[in-house]
Interface confidence: medium
Amino acid sequence: FPQDRPFEDTCRGNPGHYYDKAVRRCCYRCPTGLFPTQQCPQRPADCRKQCEPDYYLDEAGRCTACVSCSRDDLVEKMPCAWNSSRVCECQPGMFCAVSVVNSCARCFFHSVCPAGMIVKFPGTAQKNTVCEPASPGVSPACASPENCKEPSSGTIPQAKPTPVSPATSNASTMPLRGGTRLAQEAASKLTRAPGSPSSVGRPSSDPGLSPTQPCPQGSGDCRKQCEPDYYLDEAGRCTACVSCSRDDLVEKTPCAWNSSRICECRPGMICATSATNSCARCVPYPICAAETGTKPQDMAEKDTTFEAPPVGTQPDCSPTPENGEAPASTSPTLSSLVDSQASKTLPIPTSAPIALSSTGKPVLDAG
């Protein structure tokens, strides 16, 4: 545009500015060490210091580490941005008992309303379930969707929400069968290092973004790419697909870019203890098998810091999977981790607040 020429020349003559042809404007040149916050900065306020990935610029102008949501009972609520930390909250089905800045120090499972009580306010990431007496004429068991899924061996009393954070558990308040999926997931991931993929403690490189197909120019059809045997979970993290390498398992669906491999018991066997996307213990159908100790697969490689804890599974003669979900992972259930007498030491982070009672069971360390 010839009419822009005089303006462009004037702009070019000013060493503190430059002309941006794309927006046809004179832009402020950010000083060395500062990055523009917009395409064509107009003033010094439009320039900022740049931090490394996973750091944000705090109020004092310092690059500070965003909090990590890598603990298994946390999910990312807000991502790490240039001027604000990542924000974590307790995963669905849990609430925060001890808050810290931008995160939660201790998450507890939502209480299940006991018989004769119904849910007044469902639990949230911040608050526990609030129960109230059931109205006359309403079946206490099915007064709310939550109560239609009552555990088969007792419930968690409302006054005793179950702690699982950071890697702690109290077996006495945990249902051992129905409704244990979250507990099983928590237990199956106890060996995980911060931010490393579930089950396999190996480091994952950051491959950046890659297209679902070759990425067309200007297309949104690009995604993060995970390593083989990893999938992109809902939080955008590369997570290890479960392994079906145990003799009593077969692959039902393969490991895909956005979903885990799913394992099921081989023909002639039925799942007695389910875990996410697989089965922790298969038993011959319809006979109830004696207690066996299955070695978790894919829990640690030779280079990882932590080993998988020994497993002593609970005897279980259920003819059907407990919760009606797809059979689940080769990791041990929380109850099996807690009850295993062999687990005198739990090879989890070297500072995890877990203590062992005289029975060899972990007890919650209030610290």
Epitope: D54, A65, S68, C238
Partner: antibody, heavy 123, light 107 residues
């Protein structure tokens, strides 16, 4: 295998300049920031600066800002530390290091270091 | 800047001993602390990251703990190759800073 190799150290007079190089191999150079850390004889470690080879962005410890400049040559997979107005107290072994890539969070601790190059500032 | 103070500055111990080194930060750094081992004439080697996680290949006798401002490196049973200088590093806030070091010598 990740490898970092520093070069360019030596004896220089006070007020003089020196450019150190850090040749990187075994990883995608533009994916990770390269940091410079120095260690005076018999003393502890001191972080100097880093360069993002992809964007060319650098950040510095305020103690060195103005005298030291970091840069990178993507085609040569090499990071540089240009040191001007050198003083006797700049005498140290200078290391380049690469930040971690463990897990989903990329915090700045250093699993990979070069062997170091000695800079002596003396008349 | 965040200051890290290590104690002791030096200590003498024997093979088989249990040794503890502490690192105190001048402000809260969460668990954003790493520990390094350095031998004379060599580059530092990372032992622990995120305050309590052993780096791959590091022997299990090395362990780390702590959060906030107080951190500990423990060597459960000293081996001859463990005599070196140990540094803590905070990577919570820039500028990155290191402790002054703890020199571990043979008694």
């Amino acid at each position: 295998e990740v490898q970092l190799q520093e070069s360019g150290g030596g004896l220089v007079q006070p007020g003089g300049s020196l450019r150190l190089s850090c040749a990187a191999s075994g990883f995608t150079f533009t994916t990770y920031t390269i940091h410079w850390v120095r260690q005076a004889p018999g003393k502890g470690l001191e972080w100097v600066s880093y360069i993002n080879p992809s964007s060319g962005y650098s950040d510095y410890n305020q103690n060195f800002k103005g005298r030291f400049t970091t840069s990178a040559n993507k085609s040569k997979n090499t990071a540089y530390l240009q040191m001007n107005s050198l003083r006797a107290e700049d005498t140290a072994v200078y290391y380049c290091a690469r930040r971690a890539d463990y897990g989903n969070y990329k915090y700045t601790w250093f699993p990979y270091w070069g062997q170091g190059t000695l800079v002596t500032v003396s008349s | 800047d965040i200051e890290l103070t290590q104690s002791p500055s030096s200590l003498s111990a024997s093979v088989g001993d249990r040794v503890t080194i502490t690192c105190k930060a001048s402000q809260n750094v969460g668990t954003n602390v790493a520990w390094y081992q350095q031998k004379p004439g060599k580059a530092p080697k990372v032992l622990i990251y995120s305050a309590s996680y052993r780096y791959s290949g590091v022997p299990s006798r090395f362990s780390g703990s702590g959060s906030g401002t107080d951190f500990t490196l423990t060597i459960s049973s000293l081996q001859p190759e463990d005599f070196a200088t140990y540094y803590c590093q905070q990577y919570h806030t820039y500028p990155l800073t290191f402790g002054q070091g703890t020199k571990l010598e043979i008694k």
